[in-house]
């Protein structure tokens, strides 16, 4: 079975210093799927941030950055310049 | 056992287009990653570019602006397409499997085929 | 140019111990990226040695061992034998490009 586990369940960021989200593949190799990534907000509702390779939601080109690390079966989100209205829960999905 | 056979012409014209391609056996092409791997004669190896079953590609920077690679699932195969050589590009070619072991957590080589030897003259 | 340096030779009598070395930076050994060791015979495709570090793949012999500090790894051989004569490569990957493969020049060993 396939496991997507996020780094760490909480991430305190500065407001315009770079950060950085990762989501560890547990049981296969993370580049044989499609990497996805989430933002979900207080009103919960879950907005489209990246999908390989370089299909980015609208709003988010700009600031976020997606990759996949294969040599640590990492999935990455970078956001570029931190600010309040990024906050919320990320998630990272993958599919074929 | 796990057998990879690289075919494609020994002779490219310079200016041409160089097309190999790696034909798998012993096991699916699906789980894992494919590689082409030169080395020109008498010298080190240099990592070409690899191709996901996914269909996304990495490509080593100094050679991609040149390079296509290309998968194809039923086949159990995989292919190169280098254009515009020159005679820098003379070298054995080599296709190889890329394992991520879970075990381990850990990346690497675990099959190669045995190389064609490409060369670009007139 | 390769990006991990390796010395070009060494040589060693049988039953010797011999070590390779393969040097690297912060952007590759030094973030944490595990290092791969190939052996390529005369006029044969490589063959790998030691994963992770330090595992071997069953079927290699335990006189092969790999060791990892910092930006560096090492390769030892013990009991040196006249078929361990061959060109070894030290293989990792590069943070600053997705998924980039890299290899050490290459160390020909000479079994005296």
């Known amino acids: 079975a396939i496991e997507l586990v996020p780094e760490h369940q909480t991430v305190p960021v500065s407001i315009g210093v770079p950060a950085t989200l990762r989501c560890s593949m547990k049981g296969e190799a993370i580049g044989n799927y499609y990497i996805n990534w989430y933002r979900k907000t207080q009103g919960n509702t879950m907005t489209f941030i990246y999908r390989e390779k370089d299909i980015y939601g609208p709003g988010f080109k700009d600031n976020f950055q997606g990759d996949i690390d294969i040599a640590k079966n990492l999935a990455v989100l970078k956001i570029l310049a931190p600010s309040e209205r990024d906050e919320g829960s990320y998630y990272c999905a993958c599919d074929t | 056992e796990v057998q990879l056979v690289e075919s494609g012409p020994g002779l490219v014209q310079p200016s041409e287009t160089l097309s190999l391609t790696c034909t798998v056996s012993g096991d699916s092409i699906r789980g894992y990653y494919w590689n082409w791997i030169r080395q020109p004669a008498g010298k080190g190896l240099e990592w070409i570019g690899r191709?996901?079953?996914?269909?996304?590609?990495n490509y080593n920077p100094s050679l991609k602006s040149r390079l296509t690679m290309s998968l194809d699932t039923s086949k159990n195969q995989f292919s190169l397409k280098l254009n515009s050589v020159t005679a820098a590009d003379t070298a054995v070619y080599y296709c190889?499997?890329?394992?991520?072991?879970?075990?381990?957590?850990?990346?690497?080589?675990?099959?190669w085929g045995q190389g064609t030897l490409v060369t670009v003259s007139s | 140019q390769s990006v991990l340096t390796q010395a070009p030779s060494v040589s060693g009598a049988p039953g010797q111990r011999v070590t390779i070395s393969c040097t690297g930076s912060?952007?590759?050994?030094?973030?944490?990226?595990?290092v791969k060791w190939y052996q390529q015979l005369p006029g044969t495709a490589p063959k790998l040695l030691i994963y992770g570090n330090t595992d071997r793949p069953s079927g290699v012999p335990d006189r092969f061992s790999g060791s990892k500090s910092g930006t560096s790894a090492s390769l030892a051989i013990t009991g040196l034998q006249a078929e361990d004569e061959a060109d070894y490569y030290c293989?990792?990957?590069?943070?600053?490009?997705?998924?980039?493969?890299?290899f050490g020049g290459g160390t020909k060993l000479t079994v005296l």
């Open positions: 191709i996901f079953t996914t269909g996304n590609t």
């Open positions: 293989q990792s990957y590069d943070s600053r490009l997705t998924g980039y493969v890299v």
């Open positions: 912060s952007s590759n050994i030094g973030a944490d990226y595990d």
């Open positions: 190889a499997r890329e394992k991520w072991d879970s075990s381990s957590s850990a990346l690497y080589f675990d099959f």
